[in-house]
Structures are given as C-alpha cells and as structure tokens.
Amino acid sequence: LIIGFGISGRHSITVTTVASAGNIGEDGILSCTFEPDIKLSDIVIQWLKEGVLGLVHEFKEGKDELSEQDEMFRGRTAVFADQVIVGNASLRLKNVQLTDAGTYKCYIITSKGKGNANLEYKTGAPYSKPSMTLEPNKDLRPGDTVTITCSSYRGYPEAEVFWQDGQGVPLTGNVTTSQMANEQGLFDVHSVLRVVLGANGTYSCLVRNPVLQQDAHGSVTITGQPMTFPPEALW
C-alpha cells in the first residue's frame, strides 16, 4: 500500500495505490484511489509509467483525453468513468504483456489540490499443471534408482520448484531443475528428481510462481511389486 500526498502545501490530497500483479494475456487492474471531489469536471487523472515518454492514460472534465497517450498503450486502457466521482482512479489494462511491468504513477488533480502515488506493477503467467514422467517406467523394484521428471509450461517469471515425499518431507538432494524461455519470453520448467525406490512411494513436485503466488502440483504414486506404470500421471 502506497499513500502519496500532494506537494503544494495546504493544497494536497491523499492518493493511495496498491502494488499488484497482472496475468499476462488477460486484462489487469492498476488500483488507485483518492479523496473524492463533488464535481466530476474538476477531476483530472493521469497515469504515467517510468521510462515511457507519453501518458498511459488521461481522464479530465469527465472524459478520456488520449491525445498525449503513448503508442504502447493505445487502445488498451480505461478508467472506470462512473466511479471516478467516488474517488476511484483505477486503470484497466487490456491484454497485459510482460513489458507492462514497471513503476506507474497515479497523479490526481481536484478542486481540493493535487496528489500522486507510485505503484509497482508486476506481470506473470501461471504455470500449467505439471506432467510427471518416470524413467524407467516398468519392471521396477524396491531399491531401483529412478528419475522422475516434473514438467510445467508457459509461466512467467521463472518458477520455484519443490519436491516432497508422501509424508510431506522435502526432497532436496539429487534434484536438477532447468528453465527455458520460449519465443514469447514465457518459461518451460523441467525438474528431475533421482530417487531410490522404497516399497511404496508418492513423489510430488510443486511449481510455484513467485509473482502470482500460484502453485501448480503434480505427483506420482508407485505402489506394489511388480509395477506397471503409465507414462504420465496427473495429480
């Protein structure tokens, strides 16, 4: 939560923003509120982005004013016009892209004064439900060493990967994780666990998106002897 104040002495108003994360490939909201004014025509909202020359969005005299809008935001931004009068200056951003991440400023002018607050906007893409593969995947016996691969796709930013056994005990040894960006900058993650089989065992991987606070789970359960095992099992 960031609260900003105007810098014009007594003519200052409180502007409040909330740091947020947007899902790549969806519409996002950049939250900003301010002390409301009784006349819509007296309210000016300007959204700016650090490192961007033009405006992200401007709303004044009760309507959008887009003549100074930067090219990268053309056709993509909107304020909630009917809620401006009650102090909502939040911005809707269409089709959030990886490049939309950054520091934004919500700048407000009303008849009471001016104020602004910065907002840190992060972008992320959720990881897919992991697919689990086992090698070798048949004729397994207790004591055999197997490699279990957990694969999850099209996430951003890079994931954190955790392995655990059926009792929830973390498995940290013999884990190799690789992450590769595709042409769109999204990551595919492959994590390999080498483990010596017990009589029965459940092995789970958790792929965590640190920006979206999203967890994707996959697990494989190896039971009974002898075993036949499907090439892919989903949790």
């Epitope: 969806e26 309507k63 056709g75 909107a78």
Partner: antibody, heavy 115, light 109 residues
Framework: EVQLVESGGGLIQPGGSLRLSCAAS????????MNWVRQAPGKGLEWVSV???????YYADSVKGRVTISRDNSKNTLYLQMNSLRAEDTAVYYC?????????WGQGTTVTVSS | EIVLTQSPGTLSLSPGERATLSCRAS???????LAWYQQKPGQAPRLLIY???SRATGIPDRFSGSGSGTDFTLTISRLEPEDFAVYYC??????????FGQGTKLEIK
C-alpha cells in the same frame, strides 16, 4: 505476412455439429485475444466468442453452452466447436485478432444450417 | 449490456461530400475501447479507427474519429468512390465482452 484463413464451414442439419478452424500466420495466436465474429445473411456483425492469451474464454449469450472456442498453440490455429446448431446460426463466420482492436480478419467461412 | 446505436441507418451522399456517422452507447464506453470498421459486399470488415480517434495502419487521413463517453463520430472529410460501404462501431470491455452497432450504410446519391 500477417494472415488468418478460416475453414470448416458447410451445410449442416439442425441439431448437428461443426468445427471451424482458423489458421494464423505471421503472428502467434496465443499472444493475442482471438475472436470469432459472425454475420447472418443481410445482417450486421455479431460477436460470438473470444479466447484470451491466458486461455480464458468468453461467449455471447446467444451461443453460450453450444459453442467452445479453443486453440492449438503448436499449430497456431484457432477453433470454434459448434453443437446443437440452429437455423439462426446460419452466417459467415470470421476469426479476428484483437490487439488494440480487431485489426486482422480472415476471409470468412460460411455455415448454413438447414434441413 | 451496452447497446451501440448507429445513425443514420442509411446515408446517401455524393463523392466529394463530407460524411458524418454517429455511434451512441447506452452507457459510458472508454474511448480506448471504441473502434470503427468498414465492410464492403463479400469482404471481411476492415479496421479504420481504434481508440476512438487513432487511424489504423494504411487508413487515409480523410477518415477521422472523435467523441467520448456515450457519443462517438466517424467523419469522412471528402468521399471517394471506394468509401461507399457499411460502417460499424464496436466496443470492448463490458458484458458481453464485445458489442457492434447495427451498422450505417453509406450509399451513392
């Protein structure tokens, strides 16, 4: 060259099913909002469905529960699965990319629902 | 649901004249999410204007868009023979996610 090419239209009986395809070239389908828009003979444009880059989908009330929009990222192709077809579904179906607006359209594929 | 109403339904003008097409929304629409399209018989629509006033790539400067809130206008300053077609306005962002106006037919007088 940025291009969309629809296929899969045809004559179908009421209650039948059809799958329309839209092959994209010159850009990546999964990075854009991709739409299906239809136009009944002599009528205006009617939005049918959208799939966001994230995979989230939305539908017009007139088709909700009867159509499914999807995509195959590996084929860079958009689909519209249409079930329980009615006479009023007769139209030219266009796929369209939405960046800042619907800036790229296919040539359309005709669906005729008739017994 | 936002309804877009275009007027007039049909506009009869001569080449060289100025055309003014109106699009009125039943509730406020963000200027960023308002677009205009041109469609000729047997062809797919073509994007003319996005963000209420920005010309799409390759669109001649005789086409201009303006307006905000609930009232939007497409103006063709000097009609060329190839401009006679049907014009649609369209909004994004409310339920349903996209809405088109019913169209204005621009015909040769």
């Amino acid at each position: 060259e940025v291009q969309l090419v629809e296929s899969g239209g045809g004559l179908i009986q009421p209650g039948g099913s059809l799958r329309l395809s839209c092959a994209a070239s010159g850009f990546t389908v999964s990075s854009n909002y991709m739409n299906w828009v239809r136009q009944a003979p002599g009528k205006g444009l009617e939005w049918v469905s959208v799939i966001y880059g994230s995979g989230r989908t939305y539908y017009a009330d007139s088709v909700k529960g009867r159509v499914t929009i999807s995509r195959d990222n590996s084929k860079n192709t958009l689909y519209l699965q249409m079930n329980s077809l009615r006479a009023e579904d007769t139209a030219v179906y266009y796929c369209a990319r939405d960046t800042y607006a619907m800036d790229v359209w296919g040539q359309g594929t005709t669906v005729t629902v008739s017994s | 649901e936002i309804v877009l109403t275009q007027s007039p339904g049909t506009l009869s003008l001569s080449p060289g004249e100025r055309a003014t097409l109106s699009c009125r929304a039943s509730q406020s629409v963000s200027s960023s999410y308002l677009a205009w399209y041109q469609q000729k018989p047997g062809q797919a629509p073509r994007l003319l204007i996005y963000g209420a006033s920005s010309r799409a790539t390759g669109i001649p400067d005789r086409f201009s868009g303006s307006g905000s809130g609930t009232d939007f206008t497409l103006t063709i300053s000097r009609l060329e023979p190839e401009d006679f077609a049907v014009y649609y306005c369209q909004q994004y962002g409310s339920s349903p996610m996209y809405t088109f106006g019913q169209g204005t037919k621009l015909e040769i007088k």
